[in-house]
C-alpha cells in the first residue's frame, strides 16, 4: 500500500502519527500554549494522500494560530469594556451594572490560553423574576426576557462558535433554571484538567452522597444527597478503541478508568461497574449483571485484559452501538429485577464515555440516549437517576455538538468536556472524586490533589497547645474527640487553659476549641521504671480529649479512620463479620510498612514501620542509648510490644512538638491511624526555631535514630472503654 508524503510540518508546532505514514494513520498537530493548530489533524487515505477532516479545498499549509476568546454579543442592564471583536489570551473584559441592578458573577474576566474565559458569567440582576436572571454568556445571544415560573429562554452562539450546555432552559417551581448554563466556545478550545476535575467531581459527588459546599444557598436546595449509603450505583465505562485512538492513548484510557474504579469503590456505597470498549462494534468486558461487577479487583482485572487489538477488524467509531449495549444491559437488569420493584427503580446510573472523536457510523448516539432515558423513566422527578458524562480527548476531531448532546444537563453542573490529551484525562480522573467534600463524618478522607493545602490532605490533624507555646499534635477520630499522647499533659492538669486548633476552610489559622474533658491513660507514668535505670518510660502514652463543641465537617476538618471500627471496615471495603485481627493483618501486612506522620509545618512525612522479626532489630538500638537509659539491663523493659518502631534507612524522624500526632497509612484512597507519635532517640528540630528546618542525623550517630509510636492495635481495651459510645468497634 502507498504511504503518505512526509512534507506535513507545521510552522511553530509539532505533530504525532498514530500509525506512521501508512494509510489509516492519523496525524495530529499541536502548538505551544496560547496557539492552536489549523488544521488540527489530517488522515492518511488509502490512496496515499492526506485528507483534512472537514476541509473543502486542497491541502493547505498547517500553521499555529493565536487562540482568542469570544466577545460578548449583548450585555443587559450594564456595560462592558473594552469592546473588541474577540480577545487575545491574557486580555481582560470588565463589567459594570446600571443603577438599580446588582452584579452577579465576575466583574473582570480574563481570556485563558485554552480559548475559555475565567470566572463566571456576569449578570446585572434586579431580582424581579421568580428565577434569577440567567444571564447571557460571552458570545451567546438569548431570546426570552421573562423569568417567571414556566418561562423559557433560548440561546444560540454567534458566528462559528459552538454551544455547550442547554440551548433552552425553563424557570422551575423551585426558582432554579432547568438544564445547565450554555457556553459559547471556539471549536478549537478545550478544558483544562484543573477545571474539569472539580466540575466533574462535583456532579459525581452529588450522586455519591455529597452536597456541594460551594453552591449558593438557593441553588443547593436542588440536588442534594443522592445515593444514600444503602443505595446502588451502576457505573458504565465506555472506552473508545477506534483507529484514531493510538495504542498508547488507549492504555491511558484504561489507566484512567482504573483510577475511576478505584476511587468509586472507596466510597461507602454499593456499586456495580460495567466495562465496554468500542470501535465499529462494542465489546462488553464486564456487565453489571455479573456479580463480579461489584468486586473492585475483578473489575480492574477485566479492564487490564482489555486489548487494543480486540477491535482491529472494525475501526470506525460507533458510539450509538456502545450506548445501545448499555441500554440492552439495563433492559436485561430491569427484566431480571422487575420493572416495578424498588430494587430496580432505586438504582442510579452513570455513564462515562471516553472518546477521541465524533461517531462516524451506526446512526445517531442521541437515539440510544433517548432509549436509555425512556427505560429509566427519566423525568423532572427522576432526573437524578441518570448522569451521562461525555469526555472528548484530543482537540483534533472532537465534535463539541455531539458531546454536548450526549452529556446530561443539570443545573450548576457540567457533563461534557474536551481535554487536550490523554495525559490531561489521567490528571482529571486522579482528582475528580474528592470525597473530602462530603458533609457527614465519613472517616479517613484526605484531598490528594496536587493543589490541595496541607490541612486538606490531612484534615484530621490538630494542634494541641497550652496558653503559650505549641506542645503537641493529635488526630480527630470523631467530630468531638481527639486522640493524642498522654505525655503532652504531664505538666499540670488544668486543661481549661489549653486549646485545640482544628482545620477550618474559612481561616488559614484554623479554629480553636476548648477541652471539655481529658481522659489520660491511668497506666502512663513516665517515671515508673526509674529504679531500673529507665529515666523516662512511655508505656500507655495515650490520651483522649473531648472538645467542648462538635467540629463542623469540611475539607479541612474530618476524622481519620480508627482500625477495628465499623467505620474503618466500610472504608476498607471488608465484609461484615471482620475482626480487629483482620484489620491488623490488612494494614500492617509487611515486615516494612510505609506510613506517614505530619510535620510541624503541616507537611506529610514518610516512615517505615518495622514489623515481625524486623521490629526487634529496629528496637534493639535503644540499648545503645546511655543518656536516657544509663543503667539499662533489659531493653525489653523500655520498648514493650505496645510500640511500633521506625527510623531506619531513609525514614524521617518526628520532632519533639509532633508527639501525639497520628501515624497513618493509606489504603484504597482512605487513611487509617495505626499509631501515635510517642518518643524517639533523635530530635531533628533541636536547636532550630524554623518550623521548616529539619536536620538529618549524621550516618555515624550512635545510637542511630529510632522512633516509637503507640500501636493502636495494642490499646484496644482502653480505646473501647472510652469510645464505646462514639465509635462502633469490631470484635477483637
Amino acid at each position: 500500500a502507498p504511504s503518505c508524503p512526509q512534507n506535513v510540518n507545521i510552522s511553530g508546532g509539532t505533530f504525532t502519527l498514530s500509525h506512521g505514514w501508512a494509510p489509516g494513520s492519523l496525524l495530529t498537530y499541536s502548538c505551544p500554549q496560547g496557539l492552536y493548530p489549523s488544521p488540527a489533524s489530517r488522515l492518511c487515505k488509502s490512496s496515499g494522500q492526506w485528507q483534512t477532516p472537514g476541509a473543502t479545498r486542497s491541502l493547505s499549509k498547517a500553521v499555529c494560530k493565536p487562540v482568542r476568546c469570544p466577545a460578548p454579543v449583548s450585555f443587559e442592564n450594564g456595560i462592558y469594556t473594552p469592546r473588541l471583536g474577540s480577545y487575545p489570551v491574557g486580555g481582560n473584559v470588565s463589567f459594570e451594572c446600571e443603577d438599580g441592578f446588582i452584579l452577579r458573577g465576575s466583574p473582570v474576566r480574563q481570556c485563558r490560553p485554552n480559548g475559555m474565559w475565567d470566572g463566571e458569567t456576569a449578570v446585572c440582576d434586579n431580582g424581579a423574576g421568580h428565577c434569577p436572571n440567567p444571564g447571557i454568556s460571552l458570545g451567546a445571544v438569548r431570546t426570552g426576557f421573562r423569568f417567571g415560573h414556566g418561562d423559557k429562554v433560548r440561546y444560540r452562539c454567534s458566528s462559528n462558535l459552538v454551544l455547550t450546555g442547554s440551548s433552552e432552559r425553563e424557570c422551575q417551581g423551585n426558582g432554579v433554571w432547568s438544564g445547565t448554563e450554555p457556553i459559547c466556545r471556539q471549536p478549537y478550545s478545550y478544558d483544562f484538567p484543573e477545571d474539569v476535575a472539580p466540575a466533574l467531581g462535583t456532579s459525581f459527588s452529588h450522586m455519591l452522597g455529597a452536597t456541594n459546599p460551594t453552591q449558593k444557598t438557593k441553588e443547593s436546595l436542588g440536588r442534594k444527597i443522592q445515593i444514600q449509603r444503602s443505595g446502588h450505583l451502576n457505573l458504565y465505562l465506555l472506552l473508545d478503541c477506534s483507529q484514531s485512538v493510538s495504542e498508547n492513548d488507549f492504555l491511558i484510557f484504561k489507566e484512567s478508568a482504573s483510577l475511576m474504579v478505584d476511587r468509586i469503590f472507596s466510597f461507602e456505597i454499593n456499586v456495580s461497574v460495567a466495562i465496554i470498549t468500542f470501535a465499529s462494534e462494542p465489546k462488553v468486558l464486564m456487565s453489571v449483571l455479573n456479580d463480579n461487577s461489584r468486586d473492585m479487583t475483578e473489575v480492574i482485572s477485566s479492564l487490564e485484559n482489555a486489548n487494543y487489538k480486540d477491535h482491529e477488524n472494525g475501526t470506525g467509531t460507533n458510539t450509538y452501538a456502545a450506548l445501545n449495549s448499555v441500554y440492552l444491559m439495563m433492559n436485561n437488569q430491569m427484566r431480571l429485577l422487575g420493572m416495578e420493584t424498588m430494587a430496580w427503580q432505586e438504582i442510579r446510573h452513570a455513564i462515562i464515555l471516553l472518546t477521541d472523536g465524533k461517531s462516524n457510523m451506526g446512526g445517531s448516539p442521541k437515539t440510544a440516549v433517548d432509549h436509555i432515558r425512556e427505560i429509566l423513566n427519566i423525568n423532572q422527578k427522576r432526573n437524578d437517576y441518570l448522569d451521562i458524562y461525555a469526555i472528548g480527548v484530543g482537540k483534533l476531531d472532537v465534535d463539541w455538538r455531539e458531546l454536548n448532546e450526549l452529556g446530561s444537563k443539570k443545573d450548576g453542573e457540567r457533563h461534557a468536556f474536551i481535554l487536550q490529551d490523554t495525559k490531561a484525562l489521567h490528571q482529571v480522573f486522579e482528582h475528580m472524586l474528592d470525597v473530602s467534600k462530603l458533609t457527614d463524618t465519613i472517616c479517613g478522607v484526605g484531598n490528594m490533589s496536587a493543589n490541595a493545602s496541607d490541612q486538606e490532605r490531612t484534615p484530621w490533624h490538630v494542634t494541641i497547645k497550652p496558653k503559650s507555646q505549641e506542645t503537641c499534635r493529635g488526630a480527630l477520630i470523631s467530630d468531638q474527640w481527639v486522640l493524642t499522647a498522654a505525655h503532652c499533659f504531664r505538666d499540670g492538669n488544668d486543661h481549661s487553659l489549653w486549646r485545640v486548633n482544628v482545620g477550618d476552610p474559612k481561616s488559614q489559622w484554623g479554629k480553636e476549641f476548648l477541652i471539655e474533658k481529658a481522659v489520660i491513660s491511668p497506666g502512663f507514668d513516665v517515671f515508673a521504671k526509674k529504679n531500673q535505670g529507665i529515666l523516662e518510660f512511655y508505656g500507655d502514652d495515650i490520651a483522649l480529649l473531648k472538645l467542648a463543641q462538635k467540629v463542623k465537617m469540611s475539607t479541612h476538618a474530618r476524622p481519620i479512620c480508627l482500625p477495628c471500627t465499623m467505620e474503618a471496615n466500610l472504608a476498607l471495603r471488608r465484609p461484615q463479620g471482620s475482626t480487629c485481627r483482620d484489620h491488623e493483618n490488612e494494614l500492617l501486612n509487611k515486615q516494612s510498612v510505609p506510613a506517614h506522620f505530619v510535620a510541624l509545618n503541616g507537611s506529610k512525612l514518610n516512615i517505615n514501620l518495622k514489623m515481625g522479626v524486623e521490629w526487634t532489630s529496629c528496637a534493639e538500638v535503644v540499648s545503645q542509648e546511655k543518656t536516657m537509659f544509663p543503667n539499662l539491663t533489659d531493653v525489653r523493659e523500655v520498648v514493650t510490644d505496645q510500640f511500633l518502631c521506625s527510623g531506619t534507612q531513609e525514614d524521617e524522624s518526628p520532632c519533639k512538638g509532633e508527639s501525639g500526632g497520628a501515624v497513618f497509612l493509606e489504603r484504597r484512597f482512605r487513611f487509617f491511624q495505626v499509631g501515635l507519635v510517642s518518643w524517639g532517640l533523635y530530635n531533628p528540630c533541636l536547636g532550630s526555631a524554623d518550623k521548616n528546618s529539619r536536620k538529618r542525623a549524621p550516618r555515624s550517630k550512635v545510637p542511630p535514630p529510632r522512633d516509637f509510636h503507640i500501636n493502636l492495635f495494642r490499646m484496644q481495651p482502653w480505646l473501647r472503654q472510652h469510645l464505646g459510645d462514639v465509635l462502633n468497634f469490631l470484635p477483637l
Partner: antibody, heavy 122, light 108 residues
Framework: QLQLQESGPGLVKTSETLSLTCTVS??????????WGWIRQPPGKGLEWIGS???????YNNPSLKSRVTIFIDTSKNQFSLKLSSVTAADTAVYYC??????????????WGQGTLVTVSS | SSELTQDPAVSVALGQTVRITCQGD??????ASWYQQKPGQAPVLVGY???NRPSGIPDRFSGSTSGNAASLTITGSQAEDEADYYC???????????FGGGTKLTVL
C-alpha cells in the same frame, strides 16, 4: 478460625526427598506478618524447628539441617511446602506446619496442623 | 550457646501450684513462648511474651521472666493439665528458633 492441614506421602525412601504441603484455610497466607513454619517431632522425643517462610519470600531455616531444607510458598493456592532432601532414618517424625507470629520480643506458633507421620525406610 | 534447658519431669499435687522452668542465654534478649502437648495431639500455645495468654487458655496459666530464665506457673493444677510442656524462643542471634527439650508434668 484459621486451620492448617499437612499433606504428603507417609513413607519416603532413604536418600530421597521428603515433600510436604500445608494448606491454610480460614485466612489468607499473604495477610499480616506471619511466618509459616515447619516443626517436627521424632517418636518419643521433643519438638524441633525446621524452618519458616514469610509471604514476602524471606526464609529462615534451622542451621543443623544445613542446606537440606527448602521451604516455599504458593500464594495462589494458599499453601506452603517443605522439601527435605537426602533423608535418613533420623528424619522419621511427625511433621507439623504452624503459623508463626513475631510480636515484640517473642515468637510463637499460635495455630498448628494436626501433624503427619513420615517414616523414612530403606 | 543457643539452647533452652528444661527439667525433664515435674510432678504436682492436684490443686497445687507448679513452676516449669526454661533456661538459656537467648532469654535475656527474647521472651519465651510455652506449649502444652497431650499424647497424640498437636501442641497448643498456652503463653507467650512477658506474660501473655492466648484467648481460651485458663488464667491459672501465667508466665514470667528473670535474667536468663523463663517460667510457666500453673496455679491450682487440674488433672487435664497433665501433659508435656515445651518452651521456645528465638536463639541468641535472633535468626533462628529453638525449643526446649520438654517437661513432662504429672498431676498426682
Amino acid at each position: 478460625q484459621l486451620q492448617l492441614q499437612e499433606s504428603g506421602p507417609g513413607l519416603v525412601k532413604t536418600s530421597e526427598t521428603l515433600s510436604l504441603t500445608c494448606t491454610v484455610s480460614g485466612g489468607s497466607i499473604t495477610s499480616g506478618v506471619y511466618y509459616w513454619g515447619w516443626i517436627r517431632q521424632p517418636p518419643g522425643k521433643g519438638l524441633e524447628w525446621i524452618g519458616s517462610i514469610y509471604h514476602g519470600g524471606n526464609t529462615y531455616n534451622n542451621p543443623s539441617l544445613k542446606s537440606r531444607v527448602t521451604i516455599f510458598i504458593d500464594t495462589s493456592k494458599n499453601q506452603f511446602s517443605l522439601k527435605l532432601s537426602s533423608v535418613t532414618a533420623a528424619d522419621t517424625a511427625v511433621y507439623y506446619c504452624a503459623e508463626g507470629v513475631s510480636s515484640g520480643w517473642s515468637y510463637y506458633f499460635d495455630y498448628w496442623g494436626q501433624g503427619t507421620l513420615v517414616t523414612v525406610s530403606s | 550457646s543457643s539452647e533452652l534447658t528444661q527439667d525433664p519431669a515435674v510432678s504436682v499435687a492436684l490443686g497445687q501450684t507448679v513452676r516449669i522452668t526454661c533456661q538459656g542465654d537467648s532469654l535475656r534478649r527474647f521472651y519465651a513462648s510455652w506449649y502444652q502437648q497431650k499424647p497424640g495431639q498437636a501442641p497448643v500455645l498456652v503463653g507467650y511474651g512477658k506474660n501473655n495468654r492466648p484467648s481460651g487458655i485458663p488464667d491459672r496459666f501465667s508466665g514470667s521472666t528473670s535474667g536468663n530464665a523463663a517460667s510457666l506457673t500453673i496455679t491450682g493444677s487440674q488433672a487435664e493439665d497433665e501433659a508435656d510442656y515445651y518452651c521456645n524462643s528465638r536463639d541468641s542471634s535472633g535468626d533462628h528458633l529453638i525449643f526446649g527439650g520438654g517437661t513432662k508434668l504429672t498431676v498426682l
